[in-house]
Interface confidence: low
């Protein structure tokens, strides 16, 4: 199953499938989590250690019982991939390093005026994947403001330097935020000239493409087909990359079809998985196991829940069954693909789903009317479980934010509903930025049950909570997918990045805004929240956030919607936006709905609404 | 021109140490696989070592693991052998090659050779 | 490992002969079979790939067939730069092996 926890001052000894630089834990484990054979990571931060070479290093590990000992070392972080995790599985990454040089072939210097403006030319230069960026108070004035635009042959940075007022951080492509746009051309009977930068077996074009979107320096691609003259360069996906970033010429040969890296796609990427079976074909490989199952789709199953395995071969040869089971060759190899792919056989092959975004129709746990006052814009993608819920009568209009917990659940305030509890009004709006966006033609969902929290009485401000079933489930998407709950009662963790966000006020008496809004706000101790709140109950069952001195804080339009909390590089939903005195005033905290207090009731409705668990926990 | 050019070579007594350096021109280095494999007096080759474009990964021949280590420094084109405990078995003359991906692994370009010479 | 083995190990032949060098393998390459020439005194170099794709300079003179296990390099009519010890190399599988050679001498 999928397991998310860290582990602090830890270091998993042996295993070791390869080594890089990485600024930090979450992206050593997602760099773990898009490794074919990496199971376990393990990070040396800057602090950990004195020798320089192993500052930053993250090391994918591999171990065929899915465990390795753990060695004490004071600052490592530890943990395991992501393979199986669903929709925590992302190439994404948007963080920023403070004080960080990563450093690479730097292949381009501008001018430019802020970070952000440099990772977004990062995002829009084809070949770039890193970049750093000197600010004003940079020590040599020559420097200051340089973007430098970057890459390496791994996609990770050759070293990486503590250094005063330098920025680093990485492309955007993989967030799907590349403006670039992609070409989804598939070109028959062509091949495509330049360097090749790996060479894998895939069973069609598709899957060579996927792997290609993926792949750090692949821009392009030529697949030879499996009647391709040559019978050893048959299902021969070449990886291929130029100086130009574009083919420099282009060979008109039967048999072969070349094609582009999907990286550069704006708002969707293919999932990093491939689910099509293929009929007829075996897939050769290392054999990790063979078991007999009922049908290739077992077999899949069976494959994608072994997380070791990468593809199988389902075995319809008379001797390799018994009954109405079949053998299921369940293999793997070093590059992930297939050693050799062979036709016209008894079996049918495919892939492990073990990288698919979908994962299963689960709400997502971890072991993590009222809008934003003093808030920023947010971007394409930052926080892709707001929806908005808004209600057609005669006009449609935003009333209340949300929380998308799962493929068909999303969680909200219980106030929302007040007087207007028909399901039938009601349509929600998910992986959006812009309100302005909405037309009459932007698809929304439409909510099959609205379910209150027994105890909710109106305009009382106990359990505000309430779950929203959806007609139909919802695709996950880099802009649409769930945040993780946090554990059932969760009291130690110390949380101290939390935001707030939505599309509500952004002063008392104000509208709802356009863009997304975004607040980061600080975590009040009930005991402080009471002291401002002398004339209500503030129960174990609420968490307060906002500024002693006002200024920043949720507001009307913003009810239901999320308090998120980033902890050990994971998003959890701590707070569900629910009341407060006015908005942002001095000393009036914002009123929040503990989550975490809720979770045997989110488990219970979740689950009985189906008759089958809804939640799994990664931990 | 493309060229791959080994260096470090000479003779060293037996648990000695020796580093070959290979300096490559003429190509895009950091694109490529490289690797190490050596040829003993009037004997065949013999695959030694390999590292990955990144220097992330690498892999060695059961003859030589935990006695050698492959490294290379992409900014200076240059691909490292660092031989350690060195065996009268090890004389050879160490060739640094190109890997190249279209016909299952293979060697596309190679370096004119530096002798290794193990003996007391 | 996957063991390769050339035969004959060396033979003499004129200008002009068909000359043919066989290579087989311990276990099923499928295609991955290269060929190497290799002259005294220099680095081998890359004749053929994938069994019969020939290298870019090298001469049509120089064929390969095969696939499994049993392969076959052939000189259609040796010439006088011909004269040099060839490899065989299976790259299905790490570690790569190569052949025990075969040196093609001046009858």
């Known amino acids: 199953g999928c397991l998310t926890q860290l582990y602090e001052n830890a270091f998993f000894r042996g295993g070791d499938v390869a080594s890089m630089y990485t600024p930090n834990a979450q992206y050593c484990q997602m760099r773990c989590t898009f490794h074919p054979r990496c199971l376990l990571f393990s990070f040396l931060p800057a602090s950990s250690i004195n020798d320089m070479e192993k500052r930053f290093g993250c090391f994918l590990k591999d171990s065929v019982t899915g465990t390795l000992p753990k060695v004490h070392r004071t600052g490592a972080v530890s943990g395991h991939s992501l393979k199986q995790c669903g929709h925590q599985i992302s190439a994404c990454h948007r963080d920023i390093y403070k004080g960080v040089d990563m450093r690479g072939v730097n292949f381009n210097v501008s001018k430019v005026s802020s970070v952000e403006e440099c990772q977004k030319r990062c995002t829009s230069n084809i070949r770039c994947q890193f970049f750093s960026y000197a600010t004003q108070t940079f020590h040599k004035a020559e420097y200051r403001n340089n973007c430098l635009l970057k890459y390496s042959p791994g996609g990770t940075p050759t070293a990486i330097k503590v250094l005063s007022n330098v920025e680093s951080g990485f492309s955007l492509k993989p967030c799907a935020l590349s403006e670039i746009g992609c070409h989804m051309n598939i070109f028959q009977h062509l091949a495509f000239s330049d360097v090749d930068v790996a060479r894998v077996l895939t069973p069609d074009a598709f899957v060579c493409r996927t792997i290609c979107t993926y792949h750090p320096n692949c821009l392009f691609f030529t697949f030879y087909t499996n009647v391709w003259k040559i019978e050893s360069q048959r299902n021969v996906c070449l990886l291929k990359t130029s100086e130009s970033g574009t083919p420099s010429s282009s060979t008109p040969q039967e048999n072969t079809i070349s094609g582009y890296s999907l990286l550069t796609c704006k708002r969707t990427l293919p999932e990093p998985c491939h689910s099509k079976i293929y009929p007829g074909v075996d897939f050769g490989g290392e054999e990790l196991n063979v078991t007999f199952v009922k049908g290739v789709n077992v077999c899949q199953e069976t494959c994608t829940k072994m997380i070791r395995c990468q593809f199988f071969t389902y075995s319809l040869l008379p001797e390799d069954c018994k009954e109405e089971k079949c053998k299921c060759f369940l293999r793997l190899s070093m590059d992930g693909s297939p050693t050799r792919i062979a036709y016209g056989t008894q079996g049918s092959s495919g892939y492990s789903l073990r990288l698919c975004n979908t994962g299963d129709n689960s709400v997502c746990t971890t072991k993590t009317s009222t809008r934003i006052v003093g808030g920023t814009n947010s971007s394409w993608g930052e926080w892709p479980w707001q929806v908005s819920l808004q209600v057609k009568l005669t006009a449609q209009r935003h009333l209340c934010g949300g929380s998308l917990i799962g493929h068909q659940w999303v969680l909200t305030a219980a106030h929302c509903f007040d007087g207007l509890p028909l399901q039938d009004v009601w349509r929600i709006y998910s992986g959006i930025l812009n309100l302005s966006d909405i037309t009459k033609d932007t698809p929304f969902s439409q909510i099959k049950e609205i379910i209150i929290h027994q105890n909710y009485k109106v305009s009382e401000g106990n359990h505000d909570i309430a779950l929203i079933k959806l007609q139909a489930p919802l695709n996950y998407t880099e802009f649409q997918k769930p945040i993780c709950l946090p554990s059932k009662g969760d009291t130690s963790t110390i949380y101290t990045n939390c935001w707030v966000t939505g599309w509500g006020f952004s002063k008392e008496k104000g509208e709802i805004q356009n863009i997304l809004q975004k607040v980061n706000i600080p975590l009040v101790t009930n005991e402080e929240c009471q002291k401002r709140y002398q004339d209500y109950k503030i129960t174990q069952r609420m968490v307060c956030a906002g500024y002693k001195e006002g200024g920043k804080d949720a507001c009307k339009g913003d009810s239901g919607g999320p308090l998120v909390c980033k902890h050990n590089g994971m998003w959890r939903l701590v707070g569900i936006t629910s009341w407060g005195e006015g908005c942002a005033r001095r000393e009036q905290p914002g009123v929040y709905t503990k989550v975490a207090e809720y979770m045997d009731w989110i488990l219970e409705k979740t689950q009985s609404s189906d008759g089958k668990a809804q939640m799994q926990s990664p931990a | 021109e493309v060229q791959l050019l080994e260096s470090g070579g000479g003779l060293v007594q037996p648990g000695g140490s020796l580093r070959l350096s290979c300096a490559a021109s003429?190509?895009?280095?950091?694109?490529?696989?490289m690797d190490w494999v050596r040829q003993a007096p009037g004997k065949g080759l013999e695959w030694v070592s390999s590292?990955?474009?990144?220097?992330?990964?690498?892999s060695y021949a059961d003859s030589v693991k935990g006695r050698f280590t492959i490294s290379r420094d992409n900014s200076k084109n240059t691909l490292y052998l660092q031989m350690n405990s060195l065996r009268a078995e090890d004389t050879a003359v160490y060739y640094c090659?190109?890997?190249?991906?279209?016909?299952?692994?293979?060697?596309?370009?190679w370096g004119q050779g530096t002798m290794v010479t193990v003996s007391s | 490992d996957i063991q390769m083995t050339q035969s004959p190990s060396s033979l003499s032949a004129s200008v002009g002969d068909r000359v043919t060098i066989t290579c087989r393998a311990s276990?099923?390459?499928?295609?991955?079979l290269n060929w190497y020439q290799q002259k005294p005194g220099k680095a081998p170099q890359l004749l053929m790939y994938?069994?019969?794709s020939l290298q870019s300079g090298v001469p049509s003179r120089f064929s390969g067939s095969g696939s499994g296990t049993d392969f076959t390099l052939t000189i259609s009519s040796l010439q006088p730069e011909d004269f040099a010890t060839y490899f065989c190399?299976?790259?299905?599988?790490?570690?790569?092996?190569f052949g025990g050679g075969t040196k093609v001498e001046i009858k």
């Open positions: 090659a190109r890997g190249w991906a279209p016909g299952g692994d293979a060697f596309d370009i």
């Open positions: 003429g190509f895009t280095f950091s694109w490529y696989r």
């Open positions: 590292i990955w474009p990144s220097g992330g990964l690498t």
């Open positions: 276990q099923s390459i499928s295609a991955y």
């Open positions: 994938g069994v019969g």
């Open positions: 190399q299976q790259g299905y599988t790490t570690p790569v092996t």
